[in-house]
């Protein structure tokens, strides 16, 4: 069964400063990941970037940089000042389409007792959802 | 498959603002930007900027700033895009565009003449 | 931001012949996560919108006929039409897809010799 990792880390040169890792863990060809927070993508939750592995990245503020890290991760630096920016305890969630397990999401916070700049490894959050 | 229906030409005076809409059908209108660009008369093309209908988040050409401001209704799957202080060099076409520039509108003529 | 390039400004070529277009970005379109390189192709002819035809440097859009070909990785890419057809009389251009803002190449205008 295919699986989404999450991973939130705060940066410690920079404590409104985030970056969001996020993975898949299957055997399909990724399409799409959307990235949101705030909750799922299409479930209250904000978009922040939408990444193609050939077409392009789109992102939207405060999302400063959204990169593919392997061909079945991503990674993505939130900063953010005022009403715009993440705090601890938001939730970033990541929504991977493939083919042909189909669409797989997984989300993730900041670990409560995590110091800045450190953060537990990455594992496969719940998954949330599903979409076959 | 996803079309993009654009608003009809424009003649507007120098100073003056204007208006382009750009109605989508065919596909989920909030779950991708709306790209705006531009083609002056015999000119390439030129990125405005974009719109998240579904957060309306943005993103502007720095070049564009401060002069467009896009907005999306998603009640009827509209984006919109207002370009002011309309100067004579403004005069193109304006596109809008979705899914990393793979749909386009027809394109609405935008006209600057005093 | 990221300049493309584009050479010739414009080409004439026989029907049933070749057609290259050379792209060159100022900065790397690789993303060295995945080794994917981001960049588009288009073609536009008189009085429409611009049509895209390859993205991701050499994928063809749905529905381009196999003909059209694009190739390149970094900063040098190029479009070829292995042999060219009367509808293919149109301008071209590159775009950089790979970060804030797109941009877009000045046009290699295409006819028929």
């Known amino acids: 069964t295919p699986e989404v990792w999450v991973q939130v880390r705060m940066e410690a040169t920079e404590l409104s400063s985030f970056t969001i890792r996020c993975g898949f863990l299957g055997s399909g060809s990724i399409s799409l990941v959307t990235v949101s927070w705030g909750g799922p993508n299409g479930a209250g939750g904000t978009t922040l970037a939408v990444l193609h592995p050939e077409r392009g990245i789109r992102q939207w503020a405060p999302a400063r940089q959204a990169r593919w890290e392997t061909q079945s991760s991503i990674s993505l630096i939130l900063e953010g000042s005022g009403a715009s920016s993440p705090c601890a305890n938001t939730t970033f969630c990541c929504k991977f389409a493939s083919f042909p397990e189909g669409s797989w999401e997984a989300c993730g916070s900041l670990p409560p007792s995590s110091d800045p700049g450190l953060s537990a490894p990455p594992t496969p959050a719940p998954i949330l959802r599903a979409d076959l | 498959e996803v079309q993009l229906v654009q608003s009809g030409a424009e003649v507007k005076k120098p100073g003056s603002s204007v208006k382009v809409s750009c109605k989508a059908s065919?596909?989920?209108?909030?779950?991708?930007?709306i790209e705006w660009v531009r083609q002056a008369p015999g000119q390439g093309l030129e990125w405005i900027g974009e719109?998240?209908?579904?957060?309306?988040?943005?993103n502007y050409n720095e070049k564009f700033k401060g002069r467009v401001t896009f907005t999306a209704d998603e009640s009827t799957s509209t984006a919109y895009m207002e370009l002011s202080s309309l100067r004579s060099e403004d005069t193109a076409v304006y596109y809008c565009?979705?899914?990393?520039?793979?749909?386009w509108g027809q394109g609405t003529l935008v006209t600057v003449s005093s | 931001d990221i300049v493309m390039t584009q050479s010739p400004d414009s080409l004439a070529v026989s029907l049933g012949e070749r057609a290259t277009i050379n792209c060159k970005s100022s900065?790397?379109?690789?993303?060295?996560?995945?080794?994917?390189?981001?960049l588009a192709w288009y073609q536009q002819k008189p009085g429409q919108p611009p049509k895209l035809l390859i993205y991701?440097?050499?994928t063809r859009e749905s529905g381009v006929p196999d003909r059209f070909s694009g190739s390149g990785s970094g900063t040098d890419f190029t479009l070829t039409i292995s042999s060219l057809q009367a509808e293919d009389v149109a301008v071209y251009y590159c775009?950089?897809?790979?970060?804030?803002?797109?941009?877009f190449g000045q046009g290699t205008k295409l006819e028929i010799k």
């Open positions: 900065q790397s379109l690789l993303n060295s996560g995945n080794q994917k390189n981001y």
């Open positions: 565009s979705s899914y990393w520039f793979a749909y």
């Open positions: 719109i998240l209908p579904g957060s309306n988040s943005t």
């Open positions: 991701g440097a050499s």
């Open positions: 775009q950089n897809a790979h970060s804030y803002p797109p941009t």
């Open positions: 065919g596909g989920t209108f909030s779950s991708f930007s």
